[in-house]
Interface confidence: medium
């Protein structure tokens, strides 16, 4: 199968980790989301309604 990270799917400089069932983005500080597409606002809020349970903004997500 093709490398799922080849298309550089992680936004804002996120690291892409390929694995057997897809990919994971580890977001740069200040970003969150499955593809690091959402900025974390300075007051700690984010562009998302809420981070998924158990995940902090910027944590790796599927």
């Amino acid at each position: 199968r093709a490398d799922p990270c080849a298309a550089r799917p992680c936004a804002h400089g996120g690291r892409c980790y390929a694995h057997f069932s897809g990919l994971v983005c580890a977001c740069a500080p200040g970003y969150m989301g499955a593809r690091c597409e959402f900025p974390v606002h300075p007051d700690g809020a984010s562009a998302l309604p809420a981070a998924p349970p158990g995940l902090r903004p910027g944590d790796p997500q599927r």
Partner: antibody, heavy 124, light 113 residues
Framework: EVQLVESGGGLVQPGGSLRLSCAAS????????VSWVRQAPGQGLEWMGY????????YYASWVTGRITINPDTSKNQFSLQLNSVTPEDTAVYYC?????????????????WGQGTLVTVSS | DIVMTQSPDSLAVSLGERATINCQAS??????LSWYQQKPGKAPKLLIY???TLASGVPDRFSGSGSGTDFTLKISRVEAEDVGVYYC???????????????FGQGTKVEIK
């Protein structure tokens, strides 16, 4: 010149902790990590963990998680390894190595620069 | 965790002959495979990364190929200075190590016949 220099090796008592330091120079950190790899006498290479410097995140091998801590002191360009509850099986040469995480936007994950290694002997 | 298995464990080659070392991953690692050379008493040296890209200063008699789970390092014409132990190394996703993990093969010793 890109350089990594380990220090802190020597004799450690069983049950104690080893603490090593890796001094890095000659490169900017944004696309690199620093990894720790060890090699027991006459044995192969064993990856222990690494730190993604720009992101400030550490990643540890499953076999050593819970005993290991890698910490950065980026003001001094140094990276430390602490290994707790050591046994004679932890006797090894410990290397730090630069991990090329991203080169020209593409992930490579090769350890392209290595220190000279420092020998740790665990014995009473 | 991924297991990297190299073959053969040791290899005796005549000067000028070709040496081939194989490396097999226990799961798909795409092209995230590096090769290292280590000489006695020295630190390892990166030869090849991302399966086939030669590191800076590495002679072009070294080449790498493969993808997925099966990889090969070839030395087209072995020279005396190529004696040493060669290791493959993978980079892979591992939930057990917070998404980033490396693994080395057990090594292949190359000597001159």
């Amino acid at each position: 010149e890109v350089q990594l220099v380990e220090s802190g090796g020597g004799l450690v008592q069983p049950g104690g902790s080893l603490r090593l330091s890796c001094a890095a120079s000659g490169f900017t950190f944004s696309n690199y990590g620093v990894s720790w790899v060890r090699q027991a006498p006459g044995q192969g290479l064993e990856w222990m963990g690494y730190i993604d410097i720009a992101f400030g995140r550490t990643y540890y091998a499953s076999w050593v998680t819970g005993r290991i801590t890698i910490n950065p002191d980026t003001s001094k360009n140094q990276f430390s390894l602490q290994l707790n509850s050591v046994t004679p099986e932890d006797t090894a040469v410990y290397y730090c190595a630069r991990v090329a995480l991203v080169v020209a936007g593409v992930a490579y994950y090769g350890m392209d620069v290595w220190g000279q290694g420092t020998l740790v002997t665990v014995s009473s | 965790d991924i297991v990297m298995t190299q073959s053969p464990d040791s290899l005796a080659v005549s000067l000028g002959e070709r040496a081939t070392i194989n490396c097999q991953a226990s799961q798909n690692i795409y092209s995230y495979l590096s090769w290292y050379q280590q000489k006695p008493g020295k630190a390892p040296k990166l030869l090849i990364y991302r399966t086939s890209t030669l590191a800076s200063g590495v002679p072009d008699r070294f080449s790498g190929s493969g993808s997925g789970t099966d990889f090969t390092l070839k030395i087209s014409r072995v020279e005396a200075e190529d004696v040493g132990v060669y290791y493959c190394q993978s980079y892979y996703y591992s939930s057990g190590s917070s998404y980033g993990a490396f693994a080395f093969g057990q090594g292949t010793k190359v000597e001159i016949k």
